[in-house]
Amino acid sequence: FNISGCSTKKLLWTYSTRSEEEFVLFCDLPEPQKSHFCHRNRLSPKQVPEHLPFMGSNDLSDVQWYQQPSNGDPLEDIRKSYPHIIQDKCTLHFLTPGVNNSGSYICRPKMIKSPYDVACCVKMILEVKPQTNASCEYSASHKQDLLLGSTGSISCPSLSCQSDAQSPAVTWYKNGKLLSVERSNRIVVDEVYDYHQGTYVCDYTQSDTVSSWTVRAVVQVRTIVGDTKLKPDILDPVEDTLEVELGKPLTISCKARFGFERVFNPVIKWYIKDSDLEWEVSVPEAKSIKSTLKDEIIERNIILEKVTQRDLRRKFVCFVQNSIGNTTQSVQLKEKR
């Protein structure tokens, strides 16, 4: 199709080489078309348009994305050629940064239902650059945490070194939805709820004498509970003796509950005590069996191919540790009579 009639938008993604970050493009179809495809309606009830050319569908995924190759080749369907780019409803997600993402991206409705639809498309010219200026040492992260139940804030990474006074007007989105009243480089969250978790996008306009473009950054916001003040507790084994059959295989499971920590480095291991000697056993990797907002239950098993007489004289000790402290639980094997 002819893309010369598409509205054009220029965007800049300046990515940090020291952190993982994502990027998004919205299919900003002209109003009122957008509302029929993306359910991101911003019309007031009084702004009813003269004609509604895009009555075709209310399916949220009813837009098609293409990339325009720089060599003039035909448009390429994003889904077929770019595995690191994912389409979600009317949003294009770039999972990895890199200058190779620079280029022209075009979106338009899949279903063309009227003569007006032909020109209903948006061309986004994306320029991707690594961050060069080290002048701002403490720029906000692309991953930000909000503590549940307290007051918090979400900062726009590309503007976090500027004071509120000198900051340009910012446009914020949460999970693709415009937050029309948020215009500063920092959103204050009076009281944090689970609701506040999500993908936030902040845009501002930059211009020189020739043209203007939108500078965009994406922030993944996670809602968390406060760091635990407790050391982990061992849920299993509970008993300190275990009846076993000699010559049979045996698996002893150690399950421990670790409270939430922002920097989480749980330790769960088995070691064996035999008279004055003790040594760590090489056992299968630990695995998380339950994870909630407040805590995580991690399990690690020790496997004996067959129980020997010698094993009855040993103590099998599960050791668990977090930043607060450690807990142990020992098990003595006893022959079944």
Epitope: K177, L178, L179, V181, E182, I187, V188, D190, E191, Y193
Partner: antibody
Framework: SLEESGGDLVKPGASLTLTCTAS?????????MCWVRQAPGKGLEWIAC????????TYYASWAKGRFTISKTSSTTVTLQMTSLTAADTATYFC???????????WGPGTLVTVSS | DVVMTQTPASVSEPVGGTVTIKCQAS??????LAWYQQKPGQPPKLLIY???TLASGVPSRFKGSGSGTQFTLTIGDLECADAATYFC?????????????FGGGTEVVVK
Amino acid sequence: SLEESGGDLVKPGASLTLTCTASGFSFSSSYYMCWVRQAPGKGLEWIACVYAGSSGSTYYASWAKGRFTISKTSSTTVTLQMTSLTAADTATYFCARDRGGTDISLWGPGTLVTVSS
Amino acid sequence: DVVMTQTPASVSEPVGGTVTIKCQASEDIESFLAWYQQKPGQPPKLLIYSASTLASGVPSRFKGSGSGTQFTLTIGDLECADAATYFCQCTIYGVNFVPNAFGGGTEVVVK
């Protein structure tokens, strides 16, 4: 309960401060203390809210910015300062303790402000 | 600011009848909408919050529905005591749960 005070008959161009006093509770996190007005025979009109928690954030209807100022003055009082009053500001002014999306809603009986020459 | 448009301005129904009031938001407010009942000389009384959750003590004849930009309040099995003015209110402002813009109101007359 909540009680508004400070309503009066004033001349156009005058300023007035309304006070909302809480009894039986003190303002705390989770609550927004708000002012809403209602002109005689008309609908409810949101003016402003202040968050009672640590951020102390204030929120205004776009038409109220500049002329109206909401403040939490103590743990049991909130004020609304109004300047350059006109006849269009004649209304009953309600104070409310509220939080969106919850069952927490408490309103005062209202105080009448009349602006007339 | 969000603009809340409420229809109709007035409705008259007999006792035992059903009234439907609509409220349209100028932008997506998810389910952050409350409905209030107000009688002359009194402050408003909360009926419904989060678009469809009944406030305590409110009879189940009151039903709220909708999300995004379109919301409805339905009053079934009308009683004389339901004669009042009803208002919708948006209860989110940016990312904060701040009660703000009201609809213009609907006067319900019970015949």
